[in-house]
């Protein structure tokens, strides 16, 4: 006798006005008598609609929350499933059901913003700046929301950038616990004469840093051959574990480049009768605190102040 | 009485691969989902991968996804996990567990002695 | 992914003590929790599943409540056999199944 068990009831995905971030939730399926005293499992698959992939979550609850991209759809597929040991041995599972979200497709998509950027700078403050869509009326202008969790709700930009008096970007700082979770972004946009498409956006804060440059470089030349240089971590709130740094090294005409993540190198002259040495550093957040990261500026250049000739010490 | 005994641990280079083994008695092996947790030294517990009982469904942490596979052979009554490109932060000790009840994970009600990767060049 | 989130980090004790360790999740998990003790060089060993559940075998001063995001393990009367590290563990909801980072008991 084949042992059958049905899939959950109403499936759906809800939009709680996130942003992006999701509810995917069902019922439970109708149990025979037999299977009452089994625990139900439910394996969720899930994905945008252009993803080759699906993330795919075997959970006992009966919601399950997660971050998309809302500038596409969405579609979710799940069923039920019985372990072994409630079965004799065989697994069971339901047939799917499906359920999918589609976006909004108000406004044509040349109203939507362009080339949309963000720099979490110096892990301090977040800006985004973006250009109006290619096609939109003058009078059109843009609002800037954003959510992680931890906030209640949606929160509107309090400090526009702006150009001609039109909104191009936002500032962004006080930002609590906000890293190392999705950060959802949507611009919207208001004009008379047309309806306007709305932009998503989503990323982590630590993976778009961009710190302040190193300062208080220093460099001496030891035993007329060694040369040492070091610098400071920028000031903020950047432990200097997570910096990892570049350093251009210039000697006479050649110029050559090193990495390390630590704030001071050592190496030795090319030329014991160079007469010009200088270096200058930028850093980065390191593979230990983020995926990604953009490079600081680069620092002020300093050169070594000795004497090369034979006599030096 | 039910046992798990794990071979195949051992000393690799980064970069290289190990294929980990659990022998499992006193159970009806393919009733069961599997599990391997690691922990490394001095540190706490990490789930690294599961498998459901007779279809057997895959899962795994990101940490080793893509790098590490899990299968069983129910008749064998043995569970593998094979480890490629190892890093040195895949040093532990591996643990191979049997789920007490559940589809592809649950509580653990018994565990291999366990036994020691050292990923180091 | 679910945190679990233990407390304290390291519990000082003597024998006889009733013992409390907290867990909590990052998100309701309703009962699906379970509590491990270990030993130096050992394995772990379930001591509690389905937050409440006491496995078979193991001592009735252990128990285990809560439901949703807070859970307690509790050792009503310690015995020198207890001082050892206790983890919780939750099953809810995978990949990945997540561990509280350890509740070391230690002899005051």
């Known amino acids: 006798l084949e042992i059958k068990v049905n899939p959950p009831q109403d499936f759906e995905i809800l939009d709680p006005g996130l942003l992006g971030y999701l509810y995917l939730q069902w019922k439970p399926p109708v149990v025979i008598e037999k299977f009452k005293g089994c625990t139900l499992e439910y394996e969720l698959k899930y994905r945008n609609v252009d993803s080759d992939s699906w993330k795919t979550i075997i959970t006992r609850n009966l919601i399950y929350k997660d971050g998309f991209d809302l500038n596409k759809g969405i579609e979710g597929k799940i069923r039920t499933h019985l372990s072994e040991h409630c079965t004799n041995g065989s697994e069971v599972q339901s047939p799917w059901i499906e359920a999918s979200y589609g976006i909004s497709d108000e406004g044509s998509l040349e109203t939507k913003i362009q080339d949309m950027k963000c720099i979490y700078y110096n892990w301090q403050y977040l800006v985004c700046s973006w250009k109006p869509g290619k096609t939109v009326y003058s009078d059109t202008n843009y609002t800037m929301f954003f959510w992680y969790e931890g906030l209640d709700h949606a929160l509107q930009c309090a400090d526009y950038l702006q150009h001609d008096e039109k909104n191009v970007g936002c500032k962004l700082s006080n930002l609590d616990s906000s890293d190392y979770k999705d950060f959802f972004i949507c611009v919207n946009g208001s004009s008379k004469l047309e309806p306007i498409r709305s932009s998503y956006t989503v990323f982590q804060l630590q993976n778009i840093v961009k710190p302040l440059p190193p300062e208080f470089l220093h460099i001496s030349v030891e035993n007329s051959i060694d040369i040492r240089m070091k610098w400071s971590t920028p000031g903020g709130p950047i432990p200097p574990r997570c910096y990892t740094y570049e350093i251009v090294i210039r000697e006479d005409d050649i110029s050559w480049e090193s990495a390390t993540d630590k704030n001071d190198m050592k190496l030795k002259r090319r030329a014991n009768e160079s007469e010009d040495l200088c270096f200058f550093v930028r850093c980065k957040v390191n593979i230990y605190c983020a995926d990604d990261g953009i490079w600081s500026e680069w620092s002020e250049e300093e050169c070594w102040e000795g004497y090369t000739g034979p006599d030096s010490k | 009485e039910v046992q798990l005994l794990e071979s195949g641990g051992g000393l690799v280079q980064p970069g290289g691969s190990l294929r980990l083994s659990c022998a499992a008695s006193?159970?009806?092996?393919?009733?069961?989902?599997m599990g391997w947790v690691r922990q490394a030294p001095g540190k706490g517990l990490e789930w690294v991968s599961g498998i459901s009982g007779s279809v057997g469904s895959t899962y795994y942490a990101d940490s080793v996804k893509g790098r590490f596979t899990i299968s069983r052979d129910n008749s064998k009554n043995t569970l593998y996990l094979q480890m490629n490109s190892l890093r040195a932060e895949d040093t532990a000790v591996y643990y191979c567990?049997?789920?007490?009840?559940?589809w592809g994970a649950g509580a653990f009600d018994y565990w291999g002695q366990g036994t020691l990767v050292t990923v180091s060049s | 992914d679910i945190q679990m989130t233990q407390s304290p980090s390291t519990l000082s004790a003597s024998v006889g003590d009733r013992v409390t360790i907290t867990c909590r999740a990052s998100q309701s998990i309703s009962s699906w929790l379970a509590w491990y003790q270990q030993k130096p060089g050992k394995a772990p060993k379930l001591l509690i599943y389905d937050a409440s559940s006491l496995e078979s075998g193991v001592p009735s001063r252990f128990s285990g409540s809560g439901s949703g995001t807070e859970f307690t393990l509790t050792i009503s009367s310690l015995q020198p056999d207890d001082f050892a590290t206790y983890y919780c563990?939750?099953?809810?909801?995978?990949?990945?199944?997540?561990f509280g980072q350890g509740t070391k008991v230690e002899i005051k």
């Open positions: 006193g159970f009806t092996f393919r009733k069961y989902a």
């Open positions: 563990q939750q099953y809810d909801t995978y990949p990945p199944i997540t």
């Open positions: 567990a049997k789920v007490r009840y559940g």
